[in-house]
């Protein structure tokens, strides 16, 4: 009897639309009113423990009181009806939770897919959040038959996989219903033949076979998915070299119908390629399969496509009638070697005389030659054959080189050291660029590269360091031998000097002093020394700064005060900043030489 509530609130389980209004009514039971000696005037409404002011209540009759809420902005509100009993004690009568949310929106973008070997799955856009439990049901039918409803699971409310097997070549109608406590809506209906929604399994067993006859082709074979018996397939075939990250694609028109092999052409010899393939219905209606597993193959070797860069150096200390010549060449990059390099063949022909042949595995050959003119040729060999020959004329000992390049310049750009020149009027076969780091501590170890005779601007292809002085030499090579070399110094990137100059006095007079210093060693310059600044001062005086041209190694300070201690230091500047040298002190004499007090 005591557990029986004193009254009730109507409605008991309200679900209302967000931002709508809501009225609740509390009705007291007669027995309760008699027991507590109360009526509707004694009702107190509370929400979330806050008491609503009495002016907002409407007394309907002696047993009922109502309260109205405008613009419910919360998803749930606890509402209780209470009565004031003896001694103003509050007794709870009943409580409800006002749940609020939104009605479902019409589902949009309904689409279906038939993954090969699986049942049809449809998905849709369910619209805005309703804040309420909203059920989505996928409905489907043939013209003559209704299929079982597909109820979306709570954790995946915007997709559903049907329970029946797919039948191709019969149109099906599909739509979605969304329903919650505030309403029910239906999507637009879509009508289609499931054959146009197929996503095939990817082709499998992809394999790659090379050809001994043609080094530019690879043949692909694969097994098609079973769906090929239902639909005609088309393919995307993509390939890339093993180290590349971007894929190239075979023109789609070449793979527009069902097949199980394809020959890829125009590939580079002796190169590993990775392939992948996918397929779909040939008319483009449906979905592409996932990509197959990748498969790789290596094209067959071809003879080297280019002769190596070829140059020579003559040992300056030659014995009577002979000279030591070192022939040097560069390894071909893989895209020109076209296979595994086996060896190099060098021939040396003395002018109008006999031929000497050498087979070499290294990239240099040292020979003793007479002072005559020689013709050297170099070929590189792999399993398939030989490259064209690189030809080099080694002129006679008394040869006078002429026709250098003109206007030689070197400059850094985009983290590379560029070299440019004006081409001589004579026909140049090729250019040889040599460079080395100038250092007081180590000899200049030369690196080199060859450029075509048409080139007049290039960058040094080596591992260059910043703050190092590079001596760059450009030699044009003509049919009868090398032209005169031209050289220039350059930096990849300058920095301030590591040390400043050490200044000293050469001669000190009563009113002047001749200062001198040594040029900074190249290892500490870190750039081109553009100018010096001499700073000098007395203990009590202001500092004076004098700029001096970088070609000077001495400077005279004049208008000095006699019998005075001077402090002097010197800074050297590159394009990137300066560095001070150590401070040096000297004292001017009281009297000039021969002068008496």
């Amino acid at each position: 009897e005591l557990l029986d509530p004193c009254g009730y609130i109507s409605p008991e389980s309200p679900v209302v639309q967000l931002h709508s209004n809501f009225t609740a009514v509390c009705v007291l039971k007669e027995k309760c009113m008699d027991y507590f000696h109360v009526n509707a005037n004694y009702i107190v409404w509370k929400t979330n423990h806050f008491t609503i002011p009495k002016e907002q209540y409407t007394i309907i009759n002696r047993t009922a009181s109502s309260v109205t809420f405008t613009d419910i902005a919360s998803l749930n509100i606890q509402l209780t009806c209470n009565i004031l009993t003896f001694g103003q004690l509050e007794q709870n009568v009943y409580g409800i939770t006002i749940i609020s949310g939104l009605p479902p929106e019409k589902p949009k973008n309904l689409s279906c897919i038939v993954n090969e070997g699986k049942k049809m799955r449809c998905e849709w856009d369910g619209g805005r959040e309703t804040h309420l439990e909203t059920n989505f049901t996928l409905k489907s039918e043939w013209a003559t038959h209704k299929f079982a409803d597909c109820k979306a699971k709570r954790d995946t409310p915007t997709s559903c996989t049907v329970d029946y097997s797919t039948v191709y070549f019969v149109n099906i109608e599909v739509w979605v219903e969304a329903e919650n406590a505030l309403g029910k809506v239906t999507s637009d209906h879509i009508n289609f033949d499931p054959v146009y929604k197929v996503k095939p399994n990817p082709p499998h067993n992809l394999s790659v076979i090379n050809s001994e006859e043609l080094s530019s082709i690879l043949k692909l074979t694969w097994t098609n998915p079973s769906i090929k018996s239902v639909i005609i397939l088309k393919y995307n075939i993509q390939y890339r070299t093993k180290d590349a990250s971007t894929w190239s694609q075979i023109p789609p028109e070449d793979t527009a119908s069902t097949r199980s092999s394809f020959t890829v052409q125009d590939l580079k010899p002796f190169t590993e390629y990775v392939f992948r393939i996918r397929c779909m219905k040939e008319d483009g209606k449906g979905y592409w399969s996932d990509w197959s597993e990748e498969a790789s193959g290596i094209t067959y070797e071809d003879r080297p496509s280019k002769a190596p860069s070829f140059w020579y150096k003559i040992d300056p200390s030659h014995t009577q009638g002979y000279r030591t010549v070192q022939l040097v060449w560069k390894t071909l990059p893989p895209f020109e070697a076209n296979g595994k390099i086996l060896d190099y063949e060098v021939t040396l022909t003395r002018w109008k005389s006999h031929l000497q042949n050498y087979t070499v595995n290294a990239t240099k050959l040292t020979v003793n030659l007479t002072n005559d003119r020689y013709l050297a040729t170099l070929t590189v060999r792999n399993l398939v054959g030989k490259s064209d020959a690189a030809v080099l004329t080694i002129p006679a000992c008394d040869f006078q080189a002429t026709h250098p390049v003109m206007d030689l310049k070197a400059f850094p750009k985009d983290n590379m050291l560029w070299v440019e020149w004006t081409t001589p009027r004579e026909s140049v076969k090729k250019y040889i660029l040599e460079w080395c780091v100038l250092s007081d501590k180590a000899p200049c170890i030369t690196d080199w590269q060859q450029e075509d005779g048409t080139v007049h601007r290039t960058y040094l292809r080596g591992n260059l360091a910043e703050s190092k002085c590079y001596l760059i030499t450009v030699t044009p090579v003509y049919a009868d031998g090398p032209g005169s070399p031209e050289s220039i110094k350059a930096y990849l990137k300058q920095a301030p000097p590591s040390k400043g100059p050490t200044v000293r006095t050469k001669k000190v007079g009563k009113n002047e002093a001749v200062l001198e210093w040594d040029q900074l060693p190249v290892d500490v310059q870190n750039g081109f020394i553009r100018n010096y600044t001499i700073f000098y001062r007395t203990i009590i005086g202001n500092e004076t700064a004098v700029n001096v041209d970088s070609s000077h190694t001495e400077y005279t300070l004049s208008s000095l005060t006699s019998d005075t201690l001077y402090m002097v230091r010197m800074a050297a500047y590159t394009d990137e900043g300066g560095k001070d040298g150590p401070e040096f002190t000297f004292t001017t004499p009281k009297f000039a030489q021969g002068e008496i007090e």
């Epitope: 931002h19 002011p53 907002q56 809420f69 419910i72 902005a73 919360s74 509100i77």
Partner: nanobody, 124 residues
Framework: QVQLQESGGGLVQPGGSLRLSCTAS????????MGWFRQAPGKGREAVSC????????FYADSVKGRFTISRDNAKNTLYLQMNSLKPEDTATYYC?????????????????WGQGTQVTVSS
Amino acid sequence: QVQLQESGGGLVQPGGSLRLSCTASGLTFDDSVMGWFRQAPGKGREAVSCISSSGANAFYADSVKGRFTISRDNAKNTLYLQMNSLKPEDTATYYCKRGHACAGYYPIPYDDYWGQGTQVTVSS
């Protein structure tokens, strides 16, 4: 977290006007019911006015009806209370509050946290 900052209070003579502002952050302002409460020295806190989220509906306690106007600018996340014909009994600290809903002029408070408020003193 939700922050409500009241401003615009001050000392004003009887019959004068003030405009209180409340700047909100950390909430979806244009989805929130808002209102004003006040607390006079030595008295309990009482509701003054409530306004719907769109600003279309506004409600007032009888004691301020015809003198006070509640409004909001959803673009600026700001609530206002225009107070005209002020009386000495309007002297109080005024608080702005987010509400679950309007029960007439009473904005059902979202929580038990009350900010600094802004002091209004009506005196000659």
